[in-house]
């Protein structure tokens, strides 16, 4: 009837609403966002769709071409003047590829009730989607009430007559989903109870979270969980040359979006990242750490020839110390102490110097004193020995002084100021010093120990001995006191510059108590211990020279 | 004090094989890129190959690549070049050099040089 | 590969006065604020001999009469007051990408 606005005007040919329809339709119909993946689009079939219809008479397929010949598959129905109308389109089996969710966005048109004049009564605005789980691609003969409603599709948008006449379309799309789905696959349905409806296209989708690289770390296209509220936590691998202290980990939402991004993974050492991916490190620079972000140039005096990596190489006389971290210069022991000067009091000595020209570009210098006791005839040094002490001490210092105290008095002592740093003992070299030649001041001398009895006679007594073992300077003579046996507080005193004396005018046979001691110009030592020797009776010989104990 | 000096140099026939050493003093030989550079007489220098201290990288001038093989035996302080394959135009002198270790890097140190000479 | 490119492929100059010899690259030699360029002197039937690193460092043991500058991908040594010993072949080298190329060699000659 004419009512219809030409849908039926011929047998198999599509109504000029259909035409102008498709012409608008194929100027909208974009590609699919990459988080969608098409289990079904009608639009991209190219040949037979495969769907089937019952009754027969009810929807249609409207065979039309696009701009390229493809054909474009649209059904339609529109028996709205006809009562208890109940028209299925059933799809061909749809594979879920393991998705638990999908989509179907319908592109359709529907005709204004309204506007079509007596068919009021039985004219619908709406049609059904239904859908039916299998596992059989051919498990189509089922009958309705197997099927499960998705929805009632109304149109957002239906036209009229004059719509028509101004060759203006009015698209409608409509998006549902349903889930959970547990079969490898389903069918859908569309129910047209009365209405006047094209319907353009079908896209069957369900959503994934698309591969993605994030922080170094691959997530795998990932599809989307069955709940609308769902995140899926999603592991994901670093990249080549990259390492993780905490698995990268993100979660996928339900609309196909990644989220909540936890842990992350970073280019190993000698690598760095460049454009999502760890590249190496280049000769000439190095990368520690994984926590480092980038290569970074080799320190000073230090290279490296190779590709990744994670230390360079120190040059030719130059040293790093296990504790150095790898980002520091390479260094070297210091250049000697400067200007070093010399302060003698009595047996002590202080030394003062200035720092090395060169620290070997460490702050870690400080100064070791060596000491040599030097005999000036022979030329020949010996260590000085424990007895010396040093303040603040001898190794290790600090600063740029030292005091030497319990030094031998008028002794030559040459002492060797190093400088050393944190790799002085990594460097093979020479040690690096500044000497100081100093003299101790004279003291008084330490007392005579070996004294010889030479000839003894009934008046006299002759003596000698050795100069003190600890001179402390230049003996200018020797004073001999001596005294008759308990008879201390009369004493005699003899003085002589030589290392003989003989006492005169003593009382035969009678013990006489000798004590020597010496004088420099710091003054006199102390005396010696009491030797005692006896003179001859008046009628004995003279005795032999002996060593007294 | 660093020297470099290269051996094994001669006349070989074309499609014929030779292999080039140079022997390294002075210096840590292990932490050093070698490279071989060579000079076709009356010409001017050509890069042909360079090969990491550790021998972990290892690079070639495409005029050589197939042919050459650069190899190190950082044991006995010495670079190889085993050359297969000889055309007349591998004809040259032939140098090793040292990369140098002040950045960015240039061959500081060179041999003398070992001249091959490829003909019939 | 870099193609490098020297210019002029010969000059003279009187001693004491100043030579100055380009090279140009096909591409830029530059890396993180570096330029990896080589400048290098060979005199007949010796081996090359390092002048100048980085487009412009002075190599130790050379006068610093030769000088270097330039970046990207031109590159320029001079000499300031030429020496009767400066007469020899003058080559630059990229050391920025694999393989290593070397210009064709500048010839200078003392007038």
């Known amino acids: 009837p004419a009512s219809l606005a030409g849908c039926y005007s011929a047998p198999r040919r599509a109504p000029l609403w259909t035409c102008l329809l498709l012409c608008a339709a194929l100027r909208t119909l974009l590609a699919s966002p990459s988080n969608e993946v098409n289990l079904l689009d009608s639009r991209t079939v190219m040949g037979d769709l495969g769907w089937i219809a019952f009754p027969k008479n009810g929807w249609e397929e409207i065979g039309e071409v696009d701009e390229n010949y493809a054909p474009i598959h649209t059904y339609q129905v529109c028996k709205v003047m006809e009562q208890n109308q109940n028209n299925w389109l059933l799809t061909s089996w749809i594979s879920n590829e393991g998705a638990s969710r999908i989509f179907i966005e319908l592109k359709f048109t529907l005709r204004d009730c309204n506007s079509l004049p007596g068919g009021l009564g039985t004219c619908k605005e709406t049609f059904n989607m239904y859908y039916f789980e299998s596992d059989d691609q051919n498990g189509r003969n089922i009958k309705e009430n197997q099927y499960i409603k998705i929805d009632t599709i109304a149109a957002d948008e239906s036209f009229t007559e004059l719509d028509l006449g101004d060759r203006v379309m009015k698209l409608n799309t409509e998006v549902r989903d349903v889930g959970p789905l547990s079969k490898k696959g389903f069918y859908l349905a569309f129910q047209d109870v009365g209405a006047c409806i094209a319907l353009v296209s079908v896209r069957v989708y369900y959503k994934k979270c698309p591969s993605v690289v994030r922080h170094l770390a691959v997530f795998p296209d990932t599809i989307t969980g069955a709940d609308s509220s769902q995140l899926l936590e999603v592991s994901g691998s670093c990249v080549n040359h990259s390492v993780t202290d905490e698995p990268p980990k993100m979660h996928c939402s339900a609309e196909g979006e990644w989220l909540v991004p936890i842990g992350k993974c970073m280019c190993k050492a000698g690598y760095e990242e460049k454009n999502g991916t760890c590249q190496v490190c280049r000769p000439g620079f190095f990368k520690a750490s994984p926590h480092i972000q980038s290569c970074g140039k080799c320190p000073p005096h230090s290279y490296t020839h190779e590709e990744a990596s994670t230390s360079c190489v120190c040059e030719k006389d130059y040293f790093r110390r296990e504790s150095d971290p790898p980002t520091m210069a390479c260094t070297r022991p210091p250049s000697a102490p400067r200007n070093a000067i010399s302060n003698v009091n009595e047996t002590s000595v202080f030394l003062e110097w200035i720092p090395p020209a060169d620290t070997g570009g460490r702050k870690d210098v400080s100064y070791y004193i060596a000491c040599k006791k030097c005999n000036s005839h022979a030329g020949v040094c010996e260590e000085c020995g424990g007895h010396v002490r040093y303040l603040p001490r001898q190794s290790g210092l600090k600063n740029t002084s030292v005091m030497m105290v319990d030094l031998l008095a008028h002794t030559n002592y040459t002492f060797e100021i190093e400088a050393v740093n944190g790799v002085s003992d990594l460097s093979p070299g020479a040690r690096q010093y500044v000497s100081v030649n100093v003299t101790t001041n004279q003291a008084a001398p330490s007392p005579v120990t070996n004294v010889k009895k030479g000839k003894i006679a009934k008046n006299s007594i002759s003596l000698s001995w050795q100069e003190p073992d600890r001179p402390n300077g230049i003996i200018l003579e020797y004073e001999i006191k001596y005294f008759e046996k308990d008879q201390e507080t009369s004493y005699t005193i003899i003085k002589s510059k030589e290392t003989t004396i003989t006492a005169e005018g003593l009382k035969p046979a009678s013990v006489y108590v000798f004590q020597i001691r010496a004088r420099t110009a710091a003054g006199y030592g102390v005396f010696s211990r009491r030797f005692e020797f006896e003179t001859t009776p008046v009628f004995a010989a003279s005795s032999d020279q002996s060593q007294i104990p | 004090e660093v020297q470099l000096v290269e051996s094994g140099g001669g006349l070989v026939q074309p499609g014929g094989s030779l292999k080039l050493s140079c022997a390294a003093s002075g210096f840590t030989f292990s932490t050093f890129g070698i490279h071989w550079v060579r000079q076709a007489p009356g010409k001017g220098l050509e890069w042909v190959a360079s090969i990491s201290g550790a021998s972990t990288t290892i690079y070639y001038a495409d005029s050589v690549k197939g042919r050459f093989t650069i190899s190190r035996d950082n044991s006995k302080n010495t670079l190889y070049l085993q050359m297969n394959s000889l055309r007349a135009e591998d004809t040259a002198v032939y140098y090793c050099?040292?990369?140098?270790?002040?950045?960015?890097?240039?061959?500081?140190?060179w041999g003398q040089g070992t001249l091959v000479t490829v003909s019939s | 590969d870099i193609v490098m490119t020297q210019s002029p492929d010969s000059l003279a100059v009187s001693l004491g006065e100043r030579a100055t010899i380009n090279c140009k690259s096909s591409?830029?030699?530059?890396?993180?604020?570096?330029?990896?360029m080589n400048w290098y002197q060979q005199k007949p039937g010796k081996a090359p001999k390092l002048l100048i690193y980085?487009?412009?460092n002075l190599e130790s043991g050379i006068p610093d009469r030769f000088s270097g500058s330039g970046s990207g991908t031109d590159f320029t040594l001079t000499i300031s007051r030429l020496e009767p010993e400066d007469a020899a072949v003058y080559y630059c080298?990229?050391?920025?990408?694999?393989?290593?190329?070397f210009g064709q060699g500048t010839k200078l000659e003392i007038k």
């Open positions: 591409q830029s030699v530059d890396y993180d604020g570096d330029s990896y």
């Open positions: 050099a040292r990369y140098g270790t002040s950045f960015p890097y240039g061959l500081d140190y």
């Open positions: 980085g487009a412009s």
């Open positions: 080298q990229q050391s920025n990408e694999d393989p290593f190329t």
